[in-house]
Amino acid sequence: AGVFELQIHSFGPGPGPGAPRSPCSARLPCRLFFRVCLKPGLSEEAAESPCALGAALSARGPVYTEQPGAPAPDLPLPDGLLQVPFRDAWPGTFSFIIETWREELGDQIGGPAWSLLARVAGRRRLAAGGPWARDIQRAGAWELRFSYRARCEPPAVGTACTRLCRPRSAPSRCGPGLRPCAPLEDECEAPLVCRAGCSPEHGFCEQPGECRCLEGWTGPLCTVPVSTSSCLSPRGPSSATTGCLVPGPGPCDGNPCANGGSCSETPRSFECTCPRGFYGLRCEVSGVTCADGPCFNGGLCVGGADPDSAYICHCPPGFQGSNCEKRVDRCSLQPCRNGGLCLDLGHALRCRCRAGFAGPRCEHDLDDCAGRACANGGTCVEGGGAHRCSCALGFGGRDCRERADPCAARPCAHGGRCYAHFSGLVCACAPGYMGARCEFPVHPDGASALPAAPPGLRPGDPQRYL
């Protein structure tokens, strides 16, 4: 565990004659604040992915009013450091985004207005416990100077904050098998220390800070007995004693989300959905008001001028969450109709339509028959994004261009014989049947019966024909 610290030294116009005008004016006094977002440096995540290592907002800087006619100087800065605590090991290589925001303090209706003045980004290698690293970056017409470092929180030490140190118990040397803790020679490398609170009876660790459970126990600190009555959880190795699957610690076990946040597992880790007033990887940042600019991705903040009154973020399309921090999977709503393929481009949603369909959501069934003639008197029938011809007697094929054998479908019932004829077909009926298709039986007295039962009804079914 440890803290990443960022110190902003100056923010002002870059060199050269094209220096920008001050972002504040006598009519619109303003003040600056900064936001930092950290990600593990070698992660393959998209640019808009969350700040997996953490994020922080600075306090507001002093109010600044432009002096008319004077060039914009370096602008007054907030006091103090921006601090981003990290709970696990420091990754060594990290990516950062630092944003400079302007808060206008004029007579805006609905409170102050914010606008992004500059954004810089980079990927750096940084060992925890090392000296401050300095940087100078240009962003548009502005120049930002800053320093940063990562430091471990005791008892963690080392370049990744994974080694643990304790004060010496004896003045002369460390215990058996334990080395002095460079650079803190008066301290000793501690024996492996499991996660704080890890049950000494039911838990153990192979890495500092972890807590692995013995069979039959679960929870982040291995204090929860596994229920043997309902063996529902498929996580972890099988228990020989119970025959049940013993759950290994899942990312949401013990709910890592603070302040009433709800935890949901993700393929790699977990995600906290924070209640209003809290945010951060584990909902650990609190006392937030609109003055802290808590709405990400262009969300509009409304409400809360003091920490006791909550704020609401109105998110732009494509984002959700109490701080607009989550990108909406808008394709999960299946907006594309008629089998269209959904593409979420971030700024817009696109549907790639199947043949025969069009429109923003593939909602329009194209006139399949437009310009599609069916030959030889056939009629066009629309359907399913493709056209079909219903052909006149004696013709077949997709466009009714093929001369059909009218007798191929054996149209003459009850053993009647079929003859092809220029006008269609003729049935020569077997004795006892009559009709164009030999479909009616002839009664011995010469009267014809009602039509035979339609397909699907067996003779003798109690079916009356009227």
Epitope: A47, G122, I136, Q137
Partner: antibody, heavy 117, light 107 residues
Framework: QVQLVQSGAEVKKPGASVKVSCKAS????????IHWIRQAPGQGLEWMGY????????EFNHNFKDRVTMTRDTSTSTVYMELSSLRSEDTAVYYC??????????WGQGTTVTVSS | AIQLTQSPSSLSASVGDRVTITCRAS??????LAWYQQKPGKAPKLLIY???SLEDGVPSRFSGSGSGTDFTLTISSLQPEDFATYFC?????????FGGGTKLEIK
């Protein structure tokens, strides 16, 4: 106006060292870093490293890490780049440039270093 | 190190033409891309930084665009003094790296 003036051309033998100077003027010397970039004949540009004149902190491209040294003299606003264990492939034009981490806004005129036995 | 691929490697054009040079990064570099112009026997000169910011004193016919992995340098109307070699440079990661260059010649 901002100017970076470099020392003259050098001819060196393989295994020797070369020290190139870059004198800055027209701005506050400690306000910006000085980077070194080289360009082999007919080739592209290769960043070697930089020095922060305020803190004397240096960072190098790992390709040069064990052979390059950068120093500065604030009294004369001059930065020095020394490259040791020279080989024929170090024959190049060496440039100093003022800047930060994401811009090199003013460049020296270049110093030609020829390594030949 | 991040690789930058410039295209085309050489280009013939006439005065007054609109010319576009592209630079593709091997991974996302956000907007940390600069463009430099170099004439024979001279040091490179900064034209554009942070993808689209025009350096002081550079004519407005030069413009830059793009973010992430794909970037473009456009010269809206070529002037005789624009015939040179152009390099892109990423500054997202250390070490900064340069593209292979695009040589712009008179047709």
């Amino acid at each position: 106006q901002v100017q970076l003036v470099q020392s003259g051309a050098e001819v060196k033998k393989p295994g020797a060292s070369v020290k190139v100077s870059c004198k800055a003027s027209g701005y506050t010397f400690t306000r910006y870093w000085i980077h070194w970039i080289r360009q082999a004949p007919g080739q592209g540009l290769e960043w070697m490293g930089y020095i922060n004149p305020t803190t004397v902190y240096t960072e190098f491209n790992h390709n040069f890490k064990d052979r390059v040294t950068m120093t500065r003299d604030t009294s004369t606003s001059t930065v020095y780049m020394e490259l040791s264990s020279l080989r024929s492939e170090d024959t190049a034009v060496y440039y100093c440039a003022r800047g930060g981490s994401n811009f090199f806004d003013y460049w020296g005129q270049g110093t030609t270093v020829t390594v030949s036995s | 190190a991040i690789q930058l691929t410039q295209s085309p490697s050489s280009l013939s054009a006439s005065v007054g033409d609109r010319v576009t040079i592209t630079c593709r990064a091997s991974e996302n570099i956000y907007y940390n891309l600069a463009w430099y112009q170099q004439k024979p026997g001279k040091a490179p000169k900064l034209l554009i930084y942070t993808a689209n910011s025009l350096e002081d004193g550079v004519p407005s016919r030069f413009s830059g665009s793009g973010s992430g992995t794909d970037f473009t340098l456009t010269i809206s109307s070529l002037q005789p003094e624009d015939f040179a070699t152009y390099f892109c440079k990423q500054a997202y990661d250390v070490p900064p790296t340069f593209g292979g260059g695009t040589k712009l010649e008179i047709k």
